[in-house]
């Protein structure tokens, strides 16, 4: 029961985590305009991995995609790659873990095969979570570096001093979503790996050998011989550790210029 619960919970946590990683990757608010000095702005800038946007005080939002591949910073490309790898690994992990779930029976699949699949999906979730955390952290580091570098600079133009204030960006919501989602996927992966240990058939086969002495009728049962076949193919007397007594689970955002009301 505990194994099934651990495996099921691991799957659900990972599912939520991967959904979060996908959401974070698609979100536009990876970095948002720093409003520390000016909490109310007429033009609010924010950027994602795929496009940058402006929300005007008028209520209109306009986004512009990064239509270049070579012109983008290497770090941004790296973050994109890490997030995509995380999503792909997570998706494959989810697919594998569905078939590995103890509550789902597929033909005559061995418990040993389910254990292997659980371990595989667990590792995939762990790597997926790490990719997401790494991607988000790299982007956050890039933001911190740029934040301190972007200072207002002055230059002389027509009619005296003309000021160009470089927009400073700070952490956006997507970073926090990414960190939490990556963490959840990682936790889910660890839970799957723990569940795998419980699923693994550590067999203890007791083979009773009787020695009949002439005058006595004593049966000797030598200490159990441990099956040394790893995940074991001994179908004759197979016993799987199941954490105690259990019953089989029954669970099989432009409005038109003239928008009339």
């Amino acid at each position: 029961m505990a194994v099934t619960a651990c495996q099921g919970l691991g799957f659900v946590v990972s599912l939520i985590g991967i959904a979060g990683i996908i959401a974070a990757t698609c979100m536009d608010q990876w970095s948002t305009q720093d409003l520390y000095n000016n909490p109310v702005t007429a033009v609010f800038n924010y950027q994602g991995l795929w496009r940058s946007c402006v929300r005007e005080s008028s209520g209109f939002t306009e986004c512009r995609g990064y239509f270049t591949l070579l012109g983008l910073p290497a770090m941004l490309q790296a973050v994109r790659a890490l997030m995509i790898v995380g999503i792909v690994l997570g998706a494959i992990g989810l697919l594998v873990s569905i078939f590995a779930l103890k509550c789902i029976r597929i033909g005559s699949m061995e418990d040993s095969a389910k254990a292997n699949m659980t371990l595989t999906s667990g590792i995939m979730f762990i790597v997926s979570g790490l990719c997401a955390i790494a991607g988000v952290s790299v982007f956050a580091n890039m933001l911190v570096t740029n934040f301190w570098m972007s200072t207002a600079n002055m230059y002389t133009g027509m009619g005296g001093m003309v000021q160009t204030v470089q927009t400073r960006y700070t952490f956006g919501a997507a970073l926090f979503v990414g960190w939490v989602a990556g963490g959840l996927t990682l936790i889910g992966g660890v839970m799957m790996c723990i569940a795998c240990r419980g699923l693994a058939p550590e067999e203890t086969n007791y083979k009773a050998v009787s020695y009949h002495a002439s005058g006595h009728s004593v049966a000797y049962k030598p200490g159990g011989f441990k099956a040394s076949t790893g995940f074991g193919s001994n179908t004759k007397n197979k016993k799987i550790y199941d954490g105690g007594a259990r019953t089989e689970d029954e669970v099989q955002s432009y409005p038109s210029k003239h928008d009339y009301v």
Epitope: V40, C53, S58
Partner: antibody, heavy 118, light 113 residues
């Protein structure tokens, strides 16, 4: 078609208050900010502030924070601007305008002349 | 506050000629998020409210004749009337839509020679 119709001209004594109205029609009133701009005789345009009809959220030019109060009445699709402690330098034409993309003002009211004279 | 400075203060051109009005901002009006300049041009005829001509520095509003065009980026902007007509006699204003408070240029009066 989109229309912003303002209340008529007002003559007030110094120290008095005045409330100018701006009735919107031809569009979804709660979807757009309403701006207020003033123009003193023979002078340029000066932005007073803006109000969002859906939540009565306001953005006010600091120069007018003690002068203007912006409100809306959603039921009648009307925006109001109340000017307090009037002085002779408040004599101007006051316009309401709808905000469009680029924070531009695409439709304007006909203007309300407020004259402050003793 | 962003200061908008227009030049010249007044301009007299012959019918059919080109008119150019400049607007200089004390701060860049370019939004990094969408690479648009938050500069608007208005036309105001005597006794009338201003009329929107151009927003985002170069986007003509619906119904505006194509003889009106806007250009420029960052801090330096230009309104061009390619062939001035009699009905273009008015005062032209530029406006900062980039940051609060929204500010206007002092205006440029266009007259016919």
């Amino acid at each position: 078609q989109v229309q912003l119709v303002q209340s008529g001209a007002e003559v007030k004594k110094p120290g008095a208050s005045v409330k100018v109205s701006c009735k919107a029609s031809g569009y979804s009133f709660t979807n757009y900010w309403v701006n207020w701009v003033r123009q003193a005789p023979g002078q340029g345009l000066e932005w007073i502030g803006m109000v969002h009809p859906s939540g009565s959220e306001t953005r006010l030019n600091q120069q007018f924070k003690d002068k203007a109060t912006l409100t809306v009445d959603k039921s009648t699709s009307t925006a109001y601007m109340e000017l307090s402690s009037l002085r002779s330098e408040d004599t101007a034409v006051y316009y309401c305008a709808r905000v469009w993309s680029g924070n531009a003002f695409d439709y304007w009211g006909q203007g309300t002349l407020v004259t402050v004279s003793s | 506050d962003i200061v908008m400075t227009q030049s010249p203060d007044s301009l007299a051109v012959s019918l059919g000629e080109r008119a150019t009005i400049n607007c200089l901002s004390s701060q860049s009006l370019l939004a990094s998020g969408n690479q648009r300049n938050y500069l608007t041009w208005y036309q105001q005829k005597p006794g009338q409210p201003p009329k929107l001509l151009i927003y985002w520095a170069s986007t003509r509003d619906s119904g505006v004749p194509d003889r009106f065009s806007g250009s420029g980026s960052g801090v330096d902007f230009t309104l061009t009337i390619s062939s001035v007509q009699a009905e273009d006699v008015a005062v032209y204003y530029c406006q900062n839509g980039f940051s609060f408070p929204f500010t206007f240029g002092q205006g440029t009066k266009l007259e016919i020679k």
